[in-house]
Amino acid sequence: HTAAQDNCTCPTNKMTVCSPDGPGGRCQCRALGSGMAVDCSTLTSKCLLLKARMSAPKNARTLVRPSEHALVDNDGLYDPDCDPEGRFKARQCNQTSVCWCVNSVGVRRTDKGDLSLRCDELVRTHHILIDLRHRPTAGAFNHSDLDAELRRLFRERYRLHPKFVAAVHYEQPTIQIELRQNTSQKAAGDVDIGDAAYYFERDIKGESLFQGRGGLDLRVRGEPLQVERTLIYYLDEIPPKFSMKRLTA
């Protein structure tokens, strides 16, 4: 059955199946792929979203997997294992028993190994740098207007507390958004910076996860802000452990 038939929908995650079978006939939604119940009042975790994405028909996937040696996330196109809270399990393995450790945003942080590989803890990504290049415009955007609009966007659309948007830098045509969130800073109910960054990334690519959205319509004082390139860098609380072979490749 579909969400539409059940008169029930999840605004924050279109990759769900919903029905009014919660307490008192309330809408209850489950993520595709995992079948886990999701809270539609906030963002769904990146792990559950990736799992749902991998469960979609193959022809629905339009992005190409980047090189294995990329220094940024390869768009996370693997079928992850998520814990009961929807977070990434520290160790991920594929169908051929190749395993690796990931950080809290699901990005590989060790060399690949076999089933004997140990990942003792899920290492937190505490600093995310979103690096954007916008398409040419008649003139540069006003920095304070741009800063205000991006902070509004992360607060209102991605539900990220303003204190976690550390800075917005601008040198035309490059925009950098810094998100910072230590384990000690993140309170119960706070949106994770990794989830906010992933929703933003998908919005920028025109693949919005929100119900009823095609992509991101972003304007600064009425002037459209069109992004032509995005790179996202992740910094973990504990540095990653790659072999020298990888580092010199």
């Epitope: 924050t12 009014p20 309330r26 906030t42 209102e156 539900r159 009823g212 319509d217």
Partner: nanobody
């Protein structure tokens, strides 16, 4: 597809009251941020009020503050705009809109709202 329907508009004298309703044809509006907008003849559509999905916080335009009240009833799948002490300048077509936002404010652009109703006419005249 979420379809919004406004009702409760009509003709009222200055100083009178109206209660507008916004319903979503069977859908729950519980996790949606809802905004009320209005468009007077020959003017641009402007934001009147909104209620956030995350914490039910509200925003009001300066021109209606203290006179209008927005509220929601999730059980009835509706959002309301109680309009008191109506003035001639409140005459407009009133629209409700739903957005997959967590919060709304004075600076929330109209394009952040995903679904719009057809509008209901409010006429304040003596």
């Amino acid at each position: 597809q979420l379809q919004l329907v406004e009702s409760g508009g009509g003709l009222v004298q200055p100083g009178g009251s109206l209660r507008l309703s916004c319903a979503a044809s069977g859908f729950s509006l519980e996790h949606w941020t809802i905004g009320w907008f209005r468009q007077a003849p020959g003017k641009e559509r402007e934001g009147v009020s909104c209620i956030s999905s995350s914490d039910a916080s509200t925003y009001y335009a300066d021109s209606v503050k203290g006179r209008f009240t927005i509220s929601r009833d999730n059980a009835k799948k509706s959002v309301y705009l109680q309009m008191n002490s109506l003035k001639l300048e409140d005459t407009a077509v009133y629209y409700c809109a739903a957005g997959s936002l967590g919060y709304c404010s004075r600076s929330t652009p109209q394009y952040e709202y995903d679904y719009w109703g057809q509008g209901t006419q409010v006429t304040v005249s003596s």
